[in-house]
């Protein structure tokens, strides 16, 4: 490789979050090169001495890959030529959190950018009417969260009202002993109103809405990652 190291290319990363047990993406783009064989992508993680991933001469080169990432990483090989160096991380672990460096070498020069990767668990809540309860009650359930989130109820009619006195939230550890199931119950619900169950930790914020009328029930859920420009 005849790169003097004195020319720099632009490399851009985006902070992101990974959901434990699922696949995640560490985003990185760079000024593309015309020849795939001239592009080298190296992913490094702070505190890890081996490489997270290496791609060169059009294929993965994993001889120096650190054990903690073995069999869990891949780049989008067909997109490298257009400047996509993003890394797919399979089966995200809690310990994958940290600072990563996307390091690129091309015939034009070299460049790098760091990104913060957070890991946790987050899931969409579902709000239902609890017909088993003695009074009109709503039940908000989300199967996987970590770290432990806060749960806040809100209502369209009673905007700004504090529902903490008329709600009860519990956290149940899931079988893998990391993530938890979130269950929150709201009592004394009035009809013809829209209620929102908002679950939030430092990684994600999720909202489950339910509109209860005499004739129908409408539900809507939304999940947003925090501190991520994705």
């Amino acid at each position: 490789f005849g790169i003097s190291g004195r020319h720099s290319i632009t490399v851009t990363t985006v902070a992101s979050a990974g959901n434990i047990g699922e696949d995640g993406i560490l985003s990185c783009t760079f000024e593309p090169d015309i020849k795939l064989s001239d592009i080298v992508i190296q992913w490094l993680k702070e505190g890890v001495l081996g490489l997270v991933h290496e791609f060169k001469e059009g294929k993965d080169e994993l001889s120096e890959q650190d054990e903690m990432f073995r069999g869990r990483t891949a780049v989008f090989a067909d997109q490298v030529i257009v400047g996509n160096a993003s890394l797919r991380l399979k089966n995200v672990q809690l310990t994958d959190a940290g600072t990563y460096k996307c390091y690129i070498i091309t015939s034009k020069g070299k460049g790098n950018a760091n990104l913060e990767y957070k890991t946790g668990a987050f899931s969409m809540p579902e709000v239902n009417v609890d017909y088993n309860a003695s009074s009109e009650t709503l039940r908000c359930e989300a199967p996987r969260w970590f770290p432990q989130p806060t749960v806040v109820w809100a209502s369209q009619v009673d905007q700004g009202a504090n529902f903490s006195e008329v709600s009860n939230t519990s956290f149940e550890l899931n079988s893998e002993n990391v993530t938890m199931k979130v269950v929150s119950v709201l009592y004394n619900v009035t009809i013809n109103n829209t209620y929102s169950c908002m679950i939030e930790n430092d990684i994600a914020k999720a909202t489950g809405d339910i509109k209860v009328t005499e004739s129908e029930i409408k539900r809507r859920s939304h999940l947003q990652l925090l501190n991520s420009k994705a």
């Epitope: 790169i3 080298v40 081996g50 054990e67």
Partner: antibody, heavy 121, light 107 residues
């Protein structure tokens, strides 16, 4: 002042054991990977072992694998090298060194003064 | 393991001379290369890291170049305190191999 101070060297018989210590000061110990490097009398530098900042990953030269164990005690800011089944060819000055850079791609920027290990009957 | 070969193994030079030491890796190490200076009875001292970057407090007469497999350490004008042994070392592979060293002696 950033400093590394080795201790624990000495004379030991072949087959014997020794534990080297390296006391670190002046920097955040648990954010830096650390190394042991040795130098036999009149010879060049030979990398021996490395440990990540958290202590979760360890690496060894083939010549010491299975006999030496690197570890670190973050509460004591100390790096260790447990050396078992020592051989005459392990005779050397042993240095501990700090790895420069957050990602392990740079050189060793801080070195201790060295401690001498002599394996002889 | 990646082998690092330094040349020459020793050289004689005078104060004020321009000195060049080369280091060749058995496979690419990109720019993951460092240079050290060691004086008798002392610990090594980092001179250059990432092939071309001068370590803190190192005089500007020292410079590094190269990438891939071929690297050079240059001392532009040799000073009396520069007579020592110089080592290259790769950190691409987690075997952190050193070159055999180059001893710079007074002519």
């Amino acid at each position: 002042e950033v400093q590394l101070l080795e201790s624990g060297g000495g004379l030991v018989q072949p087959g014997g054991s020794l534990r080297l210590s390296c006391a670190a000061s002046g920097f955040t110990f648990n954010t830096h990977a650390m190394h042991w490097v040795r130098q036999a009398p009149g010879k060049g530098l030979e990398w021996v072992s490395a440990i990540s900042g958290s202590g979760g990953s360890t690496y060894y030269a083939d010549s010491v694998k299975g006999r030496f164990t690197i570890s670190r005690d973050i509460s004591k800011n100390t790096l260790y090298l447990q050396m078992n089944s020592l051989r005459a060819e392990d005779t050397a000055v042993y240095y501990c060194a700090r790895l420069l850079g957050r990602f392990g791609e740079y050189g060793m920027d801080v070195w201790g003064q060295g401690t001498t290990v002599t394996v002889s009957s | 393991d990646i082998q690092m070969t330094q040349s020459p193994s020793s050289l004689s030079a005078s104060v004020g001379d321009r000195v060049t030491i080369t280091c060749r890796a058995s496979q690419t190490v990109y720019t993951w290369l460092a240079w050290y200076q060691q004086k008798p009875g002392k610990a090594p001292k980092l001179l250059i890291y990432d092939a071309t970057n001068l370590a803190t407090g190192v005089p500007s007469r020292f410079s590094g170049s190269g990438s891939g497999t071929d690297f050079t350490l240059t001392i532009s004008s040799l000073q009396p305190e520069d007579f020592a042994t110089y080592y290259c070392q790769q950190s691409y592979s987690t075997s952190w191999t050193f070159g055999g060293g180059t001893k710079v002696e007074i002519k």
